[in-house]
Structure formats: structure tokens, C-alpha cells
């Protein structure tokens, strides 16, 4: 079959890292400078990536792969292949249009990233709290009061009705 | 022959967003780049980025990241060029044109649409 | 990012006259990667030279390329009317590509 394609299409030759030149007679023309091909039978390579600002290098393109980039610190990558890089936040707290803003009573962040998500309610699995929730940690739920020793007692705050994703401001 | 045609004339408010499209004649539209390049009026050219048909693979100049998103569909060769939270400064004419890196040029380019941004 | 200089923006010749513009980069371009567009008022930009020295097809013979690192230039050895126009280099040394600001041959 690969000697079939090579008949029909010359350009089935090229190796990645090279690109099929229609300008010289479909000749496999090595990638220019900055540039890649990941696949053989290109007809064109690609500019490579480049991690400025925000991004930094995480592997060098070569003429057969593209750069990698991921975030300096203080930043973490979103989107494929690290499309974006959003500030990190303190445990505790989450990132809203106005900066990180730490999370409301009833929710918890114990990640750098990410939104303040409600804190377990013990109750709804017929548990206690056995260790209060906190800003950067979800309760810890322990035995059902049926099982507590007499004259102990625990209470479990309601979790606050807030949407997924929206951020108090 | 090898032709690109671009859409016509826009004339939008500031903040809005704006899709411009160049569809693709007389070529196999995945082998070659489709640049997008911008000229203020009696100005020079500055080059927006491309994309690749073939991998759907794009590339901002820095100066255009966030500003420009390209995309293409490969069923009609038509390549888009969306300008987002447009301002004053966004009013130009903006071409497409055909590219392939290895040599580096732009071989043919469209008419040009002319983007107005003013209230 | 490779900035490119046409230091001339306007240049006045007459019918007949040789004619020399020049582009400068702020640092070295292969030549390989080196070009040159011709747009006429109201057009759009037409690849006229690449890799410094390739006429683009339908350039007459009069227009000539030269150059390396990071001086190059546009020659046309005898100028005619339908040479008004604005001239622009570019540039490939990974992105972005970049342009000259043009330099407009008027015809006096």
C-alpha cells in the first residue's frame, strides 16, 4: 500500500520534519528555521509556538514537533495544550473577574485553581461533622449522632444554595 | 485560476465582534496557510497570524492574540477571521492570503473587506 | 520580533530613471525569506520579488533584487509609468512575519 501511495502522491514520501515543495517539483524541502512538521507528506510546515510572557518553555520545538509551553509560577495552565495560564489563588479562596476572593462561609477551596465548592452536608448520609469545615478544608463527617456517646452533640451547617462557577463578589 | 474572495464591507459598533470570510478557488485549499495581514488606512501591512487547513493548527502574531480568532471550514475552503471587542483602532481593511511556510511569501490574496468601527 | 526599516517613504523618478529602494532589518534575514510586494492605490498587495531575487511571474526584466543580512533593496534599471506605486519588504524568521512600512515611487 506504501509503495501504491508513493506512486500516486510523491509527496507520500516527505518525513516529518520536512515539507513537499511544489515550487521544486514536489521535492521533500527541509522545514525552515522556527518551523515544524509532525507528519510526513506536508505540503507546508508550521511556525512554531512560542512561550512569551505568562507562558515558558517547557520543551523546545524541533523540526518535527512543536514547542511546549506551561505557566511561570504563580500561574497554572487551562485549555489544550496549555492554551491559557490563570493566576493562582491561596487555599481558600477562588478566582473572580475582580482577583482571588476567599471563598463565602458553607465553601471550601483546598486547591490553588479552581472554584469554592459547598462543604459536605454530614446529615444527608445520616453522619455528624466531626470536624468543622474551613475556608481551605471540607468537614470531616464522623459516626451518626445515633452512634455518639450520650451528651455529645453536632451540628451541621447548611450548605449554601450557590450555582457551580459563579463567584461571590 | 486560484482566486480568494473575500466577504464585503462591514460597518459595526465599538464592542461588538465582526466575522470576516474568504473562500478559496482554483487550489487544494489544506495545502497552503491562509494568512490574514491588516492595513489602517495609509498605513502599511501587519501581519494578524494564519491557519492551517490541513491540521487546523493557528497562529497569532502576539500583537493580535485575543483579538482575532481564525477558523476554517474545510467542506466550502472558506477560511473566518472573528475580531472581537472592537474599538476604533480595529477599522482597517483586512486581507486574506495564501501562504505556505517554506517559502516564506504570500502568493495571492484576496480583495480585501473594509471594517468600519464607529458609533 | 525582526523589525523592518524602508527609510524612504516617498521616492520621485522620472520616465527612464533607474530607480534603487532599500530595506533593512533589524537583524539578519535569510535571504531565502526575503520578499517583496508591489500595491498599487485601492489594490491589494501582489508578491513581486521572493527570496530577494525571484521576479514573481509577470514582473518585467527591468525590476531586480539583491541583497543579504540585513540590507536589502529593490532596483528597476528604467522606470515606467506603471511602476507608481508603493513597494513593500517582508520578511519569515518565525513569527511573526513582518513588513517594511513601504516605500511609494511616484512618477514625475
Known amino acids: 500500500f506504501e509503495r501504491t501511495r508513493s506512486l500516486q502522491d510523491p509527496c507520500s514520501n516527505c518525513p516529518a520534519g520536512t515539507f513537499c515543495d511544489n515550487n521544486r517539483n514536489q521535492i521533500c524541502s527541509p522545514c525552515p528555521p522556527n518551523s515544524f512538521s509532525s507528519a510526513g507528506g506536508q505540503r507546508t510546515c508550521d511556525i512554531c509556538r512560542q512561550c512569551k510572557g505568562v507562558f515558558r518553555t517547557r520543551k523546545e520545538c524541533s523540526s518535527t514537533s512543536n514547542a511546549e509551553c506551561d505557566c511561570t509560577p504563580g500561574f497554572h495552565c487551562l485549555g489544550a495544550g496549555c492554551s491559557m495560564c490563570e493566576q493562582d489563588c491561596k487555599q481558600g479562596q477562588e478566582l473572580t473577574k475582580k482577583g482571588c476572593k476567599d471563598c463565602c462561609f458553607g465553601t471550601f477551596n483546598d486547591q490553588k485553581r479552581g472554584i469554592c465548592r459547598p462543604w459536605t452536608n454530614c446529615s444527608l448520609d445520616g453522619k455528624s461533622v466531626l470536624v468543622n469545615g474551613t475556608k481551605e478544608r471540607d468537614v470531616v463527617c464522623g459516626p451518626s449522632p445515633a452512634d455518639l456517646s450520650p451528651g455529645a452533640s453536632s451540628v451541621t451547617p447548611p450548605a449554601p444554595a450557590r450555582e457551580p462557577g459563579h463567584s461571590p463578589q | 485560476q486560484v482566486q480568494l474572495q473575500q466577504s464585503g464591507a462591514e460597518l459595526v459598533r465599538p464592542g461588538a465582534s465582526v466575522k470576516i470570510s474568504c473562500k478559496a478557488f482554483g487550489f487544494t485549499f489544506t495545502h497552503h496557510h491562509i494568512n490574514w495581514v491588516k492595513q489602517r488606512p495609509g498605513q502599511g501591512l501587519d501581519w494578524i497570524g494564519y491557519i492551517n487547513p490541513y491540521n487546523d493548527y493557528s497562529i497569532y502574531n502576539q500583537k493580535f492574540e485575543g483579538k482575532a480568532t481564525l477558523t476554517v471550514d474545510k467542506s466550502s475552503s472558506t477560511a473566518y477571521m472573528e475580531l472581537s471587542r472592537l474599538t476604533s483602532d480595529d477599522s482597517a481593511v483586512y486581507f486574506c492570503?495564501?501562504?505556505?511556510?517554506?517559502?516564506?511569501?504570500?502568493?495571492?490574496w484576496g480583495q480585501g473587506t473594509t471594517l468600519t468601527v464607529s458609533s | 520580533d525582526i523589525v523592518m526599516t524602508q527609510s524612504t517613504a516617498i521616492m520621485s523618478a522620472s520616465l527612464g530613471e533607474k530607480v534603487t529602494m532599500t530595506c533593512r532589518a533589524s537583524s539578519s534575514v535569510t535571504s531565502s525569506y526575503l520578499h517583496w510586494y508591489q500595491q498599487k492605490s485601492g489594490a491589494s498587495p501582489k508578491i513581486w520579488i521572493s527570496s530577494t531575487s525571484n521576479l514573481a511571474s509577470g514582473v518585467p526584466v527591468r525590476f531586480s533584487g539583491s541583497g543579504s543580512g540585513t540590507s536589502y533593496s529593490l532596483t528597476i534599471s528604467s522606470v515606467e509609468a506603471e511602476d507608481a506605486a508603493t513597494y513593500y519588504c517582508q520578511q519569515y524568521s518565525g513569527n511573526p512575519y513582518t513588513f517594511g512600512g513601504g516605500t511609494k515611487l511616484e512618477i514625475k
Open positions: 492570503a495564501r501562504g505556505g511556510l517554506g517559502r516564506g511569501y504570500f502568493d495571492y
